[in-house]
Interface confidence: medium
């Protein structure tokens, strides 16, 4: 399909002249950020961004690539180097430490410098690094964590936890020897390390004692509480704050977010990770956009401002399954949340960053015609005289041999939400990729987001923009928090 | 390998504070660019940039990812949307039209709006679009084209040619019917469409009549002249300019570049594309860095300034072969040329842009240890109990089945320059990828390079920065050309 309009050079020249005009008008704000939002697309490499743009555009009956994601509208872009201290290709724990605490760590550790060693409890103490969220709280701001994964997952945990093993969700996951050495599970740290005003996502089962039935799945024992210490962490958290409210479904969330008596809100909507957006029961579970809106309603009451972490955490899971349909629909919901947040906040006082922790070995090739489905087939056949999809993975569970050969694929098969794109190497889970990821920035001090940077730079930009430790002498006016 | 200094949070905090300090000091220059340089890494997607950074770092005995490419030092970054009017995933012809002329075209056409149709000669006339190089020449600047491909290849041709078929290198490649309709081959257009001061690269055979032996390979008939019209285009070009010089080897190039009587220089160092850097005969053929230096020596004599196109054109070819070794070593030489150009020019008066025309379905995954070879194996085994490489392709010629199964691979095999990384789908040539590519910018008006842009924006930024058509009323001081 060749759009008639695009045949005319004037179309492109006019469009570029407008873009130039907008670029010339960009004025770096010299003010501090009252509010900080970091949107984290877990596994959202540049190939995911582009494919999601096309899909989102096509869902609006456009050809696709000419449209804009919400994040595309952010005026400043940088590239972020994601390696961890010990690996070229990182995990979500070490990267969370980088972009939330400003220090690089080791693979599968969280909130700890690289002096800590994976799974070695005794290397924890003294190596803790403090997140920007924690520093924002100390400065009198309200803070929140929103994710589509469990709230104890690696990325959100970077905002509040310190652990040598990202998999220590509840005490049942922590070896007895480590528990004896004083290493706490992530769920315990969620409620005890710092005061978090808003906590929204999945992860109910890690908060309740073993044997506690789940309210949504009371007959499914595997979904119930997992804790061995007999603690009801939700109860403990509620007891800390007079205005605290715990919710576990969408209806309760929407009510609580509008209730002025609620000062602290914890919403845990699934026992583990939240459901993929395409599987979500919209009567029971809120979308990421709805959780983001609820968080902003609460947090924005604070005249000193807020810090909010919003994660599209299951983009990564879709890719690990080699199911691009899931990864890309998750990315679109993530982008919808960014868009909604933009409507609810002002770029005059809110620094918003969008980034990824790492990429995936996910590619989009094959010379497909403009307007053709992102999940479709490439024109022509492969060397084995079979069709192939435009989306493919370097490695992952999509690798299958059928009668000693690569399976053929039809357009209807490849368009299925369950379809796993083929890969070069068979793995149970497709892996992360190590290339640089994009950082998109808007708001006060967003102009500092430039060039190629270490991933740690992100945390430092946020801290500087809001005049938080170690940048309290930031020399920005109006100083953060002057509105109270 | 965990570097001891990186275990200390102070290392990361100090580094980030320095980066913040540098970011705060960035001052958008309000002056015009006297000179324009566009460095085009053909097929150099973000995954290629990161992998090349690691390789270049390791060649300097560093761990890799913590090091800097020359392009990494450019202060401004944007993302460029590379689709062509008719394809989600473009080719180098349509993209060259975008970043050199500022207008998007159709797949495999060059220097024409999308009203032109591939291979249909009669759709050429009236649909020509004019490159920034051409506009620079009209403004009195000197102009040059440097590439590791043949100089008539798609990317450089975007600077001077208008053709409905990128493969029409010489008249022997143009169907008789199209010749009769008046469609000219690219080699002819190279010498007749505009006055180009410096032309360096490959592509000798397209300039000489059929039967003319090649000076380097006189006994290889397939490397000799291909022209059917009996023309010696080099002779015709030399006759146009009193100070014109033609060279075909490195020694002659170095001599000519230092000769003040040479005003125009054409150097064609191979019959077709230049050799891969790893195959280059350094006594006969110059490197991309050397060609770039020679071009800058000549062009910088013009007090009105210059426009220079420098292409690392065989990054793309390495990827098409699924030979990452070739692609990445080409990228390093490309980066070396960027570095050398930076030493020979000033960012006070020279706008330098680095970008790619498109990406490739090339990925870097598998959780390798820091410091391990980029060409090495991932830790552990795949589901088929065989080793696999960290570098892989979505599709391409690296797909092989051995006895109905994926072949095993050893570290020594994967480290070979000839090794083809495995792919999910078997193709004769690995394909381009459609995700956004990076644009790196330095110099006057580089700050305009921001956010997510159409690829066409690149040409417009260059034109605006140097006050060329259609931005002659650019209102920048000092105005371009005031130094003559």
């Amino acid at each position: 399909i060749i759009p008639v309009e695009e045949e005319n050079p004037d179309f492109w020249n006019r469009q570029a002249a407008e873009a130039l005009g907008a670029a010339k008008k960009l004025q770096p704000a010299q003010t501090a950020a009252k509010n900080l939002i970091i949107f984290l697309g877990d596994g959202m490499g540049v190939s995911t961004v582009t494919a999601a743009r096309i899909l989102k555009g096509q869902k609006k009956d456009k050809l696709g690539p000419e449209t804009f994601l919400a994040m595309d509208r952010f005026p400043y872009v940088a590239l972020s180097k994601t390696y961890s201290v010990d690996k070229h290709v990182p995990d979500s724990g070490a990267t969370a430490t980088a972009y939330l605490c400003g220090v690089k760590g080791n693979f599968q550790t969280i909130g700890l410098s690289a002096a800590a060693r994976f799974n070695q409890c005794n290397t924890t103490r003294g190596n803790e690094v403090i997140s920007v969220m924690n520093r924002a709280k100390k400065a009198g701001k309200s803070v929140g964590v929103v994710t589509t994964t469990r709230v104890q997952h690696a990325s959100p945990a970077g905002a509040y936890a310190h652990t040598v093993n990202r998999n220590w969700y509840s005490d049942a996951d922590v070896p007895a020897s480590a528990r004896q050495e004083g290493c706490q599970d992530i769920a315990t740290q969620l409620i005890s390390n710092m005061d978090i005003d808003v906590i929204l996502g999945g992860g109910r089962k890690y908060m309740f004692p073993m044997g506690t039935p789940d309210p949504e799945y009371p007959d499914d024992y595997s979904q119930g509480g997992t804790r061995l210490d007999g603690k009801n962490l939700v109860q403990e958290w509620l007891a800390k704050h007079q205005g605290a409210r715990y919710v576990w479904n969408r209806t309760e969330l929407l009510q609580a977010s509008l209730d002025p008596s609620v000062t602290h809100l914890m919403g845990l909507f699934e026992p583990g990770d939240m459901k993929y957006e395409i599987h979500r029961d919209s009567t029971l579970d809120p979308s990421l956009m709805e959780m983001t809106e609820a968080a902003l309603l609460l947090l924005s009451r604070n005249p000193r401002g807020f810090f909010l972490f919003v994660e599209g955490g299951r983009i990564d899971h879709g890719h690990h399954e080699s199911r691009a349909y899931r990864a890309l629909t998750e990315t679109i919901m993530f982008d919808d949340a960014i868009e909604r947040a933009g409507q609810l906040t002002s770029e005059e006082d809110t620094l918003s960053l969008v980034t990824a922790d790492h990429s995936h070995v996910f590619s989009f090739g094959g010379y497909p015609l403009r307007g053709s489905s992102i999940f479709g087939l490439a024109p022509g056949k492969a060397r084995d005289r079979k069709a192939y999809t435009v989306l493919l993975y370097g490695n992952g569970p999509g690798y299958v041999l059928k009668d000693g050969a690569r399976p053929d694929v039809t357009e209807s098969e490849s368009g299925s939400p369950e379809y796993r794109q083929q890969s070069a190497v068979p793995l149970d889970g497709e892996t992360h990729a190590g290339e640089d990821v994009a950082v998109f920035a808007r708001g006060p001090q967003a102009h500092l987001v430039h060039g190629v940077q270490e991933q740690t730079f992100i945390a430092h930009v946020m801290a500087f923009a809001a005049c938080l430790e170690p940048y309290t002498a930031c020399d920005l006016a109006p100083r953060a928090g002057t509105t109270d | 390998i965990i570097p001891v200094e990186e275990e200390n949070p102070d290392f990361w905090n100090r580094q980030a504070a320095e980066a913040l300090g540098a970011a705060k000091k960035l001052q958008p220059a309000q002056t015009a660019a006297k000179n324009l340089i566009i460095f085009l890494g053909d097929g150099m997607g973000v995954s290629t940039v990161t992998a090349a950074r690691i390789l270049k770092g390791q060649k300097k005995d560093k761990l890799g990812p913590e090091t800097f490419l020359a392009m990494d030092r450019f202060p401004y970054v944007a993302l460029s949307k590379t689709y062509s009017v008719d394809k989600h995933v473009p080719d180098s012809g349509a993209t060259a039209t975008a970043y050199l002329c500022g207008v998007k075209g159709n797949f495999q056409t060059i220097g024409l709006s999308a009203a032109a149709r591939f291979n249909q000669c009669n759709t050429t006339r009236g649909n020509e679009v004019i490159s920034v190089m051409n506009r620079a020449k009209k403004a009195g600047k000197s102009v040059g084209v440097v590439t590791t491909t043949r100089v008539q290849h798609a990317s450089p041709a975007g600077a001077y040619a208008h053709t409905v078929n990128r493969n029409w290198y010489s008249d022997a490649d143009v169907p008789a019917s199209a010749r009769q309709e008046g469609c000219q081959d690219i080699a002819t257009q190279l010498i007749s469409n505009m006055d180009i001061d410096v032309i360096l690269g490959g592509g000798r055979k397209y300039m000489f009549p059929m039967g003319t032996p090649d000076p380097e390979y006189p006994d290889d008939y397939s490397q000799g002249g291909t022209r059917l019209d009996g023309k010696n285009l080099v002779q015709e070009w030399l006759a146009k300019h009193q100070g014109a010089r033609y060279v075909w080897n490195r020694t002659e190039l170095l001599q000519a570049s230092l000769d003040p009587s040479v005003t125009h220089l054409m150097g064609l160092f191979e019959p077709g594309d230049m050799k891969y850097e790893i195959h280059r005969d350094s006594t006969l053929d110059p490197s991309l860095m050397e060609m770039t230096e020679a071009a800058l020596l000549l062009l910088s004599r013009n007090p009105r300034g210059f426009f220079l196109f420098v292409e690392g054109g065989r990054i793309d070819h390495g990827h098409h072969e699924s030979r990452a070794y070739r692609a990445l070593t080409e990228t390093i030489m490309f980066d070396d040329a960027i570095e050398r150009a930076g030493q020979l020019t000033s960012e006070e008066d020279t706008l330098s842009l680095v970008t790619a025309d498109h990406s490739h379905v090339f990925s870097f995954g598998g959780y390798p240890l820091r410091g391990s070879s980029i060409f090495g194996l991932a830790p552990g085994k795949a589901r088929d109990r065989k080793a696999y490489t960290v570098l892989l392709y979505g599709n391409g010629p690296g797909y092989v089945l051995k006895d109905g199964a994926r072949p095993d691979v050893t570290e020594s095999e994967s480290g070979s320059p000839e090794y083809r990384q495995q792919s999910a789908v078997p193709l004769d040539g690995e394909t381009h990828a459609g995700e956004d590519v990076a644009v790196f910018a330095r110099g006057p008006q580089a700050h305009l390079v921001h956010g997510v842009q159409e690829q066409t924006f690149i040409a417009h930024v260059m034109a605006f920065a140097a006050c060329l058509e259609p931005y002659t009323a650019c209102d920048l001081a000092p105005r371009a050309g005031t130094t003559d």
Epitope: P3, E5, K60, K62, L63, E66, E411, G415 | -
Partner: antibody, heavy 123, light 106 residues
């Protein structure tokens, strides 16, 4: 040149069904989105239904007022667009137009229209 | 669903007058708006799409502008043959027409 010719209109009683056709020529039918739009006497235009092209699997969309009663379909071998209208109401009285979208840069604007066919629903 | 509010519903003007019609969308429609002219007994005719792009053969006295939610259609110098009803159409999210503006000569 692009031509769209609607047929099948006429007088029909409330509660009954009617099928409209739109015969297309002058373009590759399968490449384009097709829509039905109606205009009640003396009133404005109302978009009713859309059927997408081959590349997007011929998926359909409807405006709320006709969803469940009207069905858009296409016979690609004959280049004919259909609108099956069931459980007709008096308020469905209108001139019915078929329209073809054009893929400009900006999406799916309704660029080509038929001359319309009048449907009168009355007892 | 995106709603389009078109105003005025009717207007009377003299030949040579500058005429302006506005459409307001219920949400940002990203410039995806078209303007149509319809004469009695005829099908609508596309004049402008993507806010401001004139269809081939449409006189240059017709123009469009706007962004976000607010859009304007202008006839710079009204001609007798311009007497018709004009509709806006958003096509950002499926399709929605404005209510129409009936243009008459004074």
């Amino acid at each position: 040149e692009v031509q769209l010719v609607e047929s099948g209109g006429g007088l029909v009683q409330p509660g009954r069904s009617l099928r409209l056709s739109c015969t297309a020529s002058g373009f590759t039918f399968t490449d384009y989105y097709m829509s039905w739009v109606r205009q009640a006497p003396g009133k404005g235009l109302e978009w009713l239904a859309l059927i997408r092209n081959k590349a997007t699997g011929y998926t359909t969309e409807y405006t709320a007022s006709v969803k469940g009663r009207f069905t858009i379909s296409r016979d690609n071998s004959k280049s004919i667009l259909y609108l099956q209208m069931n459980s007709l109401k008096t308020e469905d009285t209108a001139v019915y137009y078929c329209a073809r979208a054009s893929f400009y840069y900006d999406g799916k604007v309704l660029a080509y229209w038929g001359q319309g066919t009048l449907v009168t629903v009355s007892s | 669903d995106t709603q389009m509010t078109q105003s005025p519903s009717s207007l009377s003007a003299s030949v040579g007058d500058r005429v302006t019609i506005t459409c307001k969308a219920s949400q940002d429609i990203n410039k995806y708006i078209a303007w149509y002219q319809q004469k009695p007994g005829k099908a609508p005719k596309l004049l402008i799409h993507y806010t401001s792009t004139l269809q081939p053969g449409v006189p240059s006295r017709f123009s469009g502008s706007g962004s976000g939610r607010d859009y304007t259609f202008t006839i710079s110098s009204l001609q007798p043959e311009d007497i018709a009803t004009y509709y806006c159409l958003q096509y950002d999210n499926l399709y929605t027409f404005g209510q129409g503006t009936k243009l008459e000569i004074k």
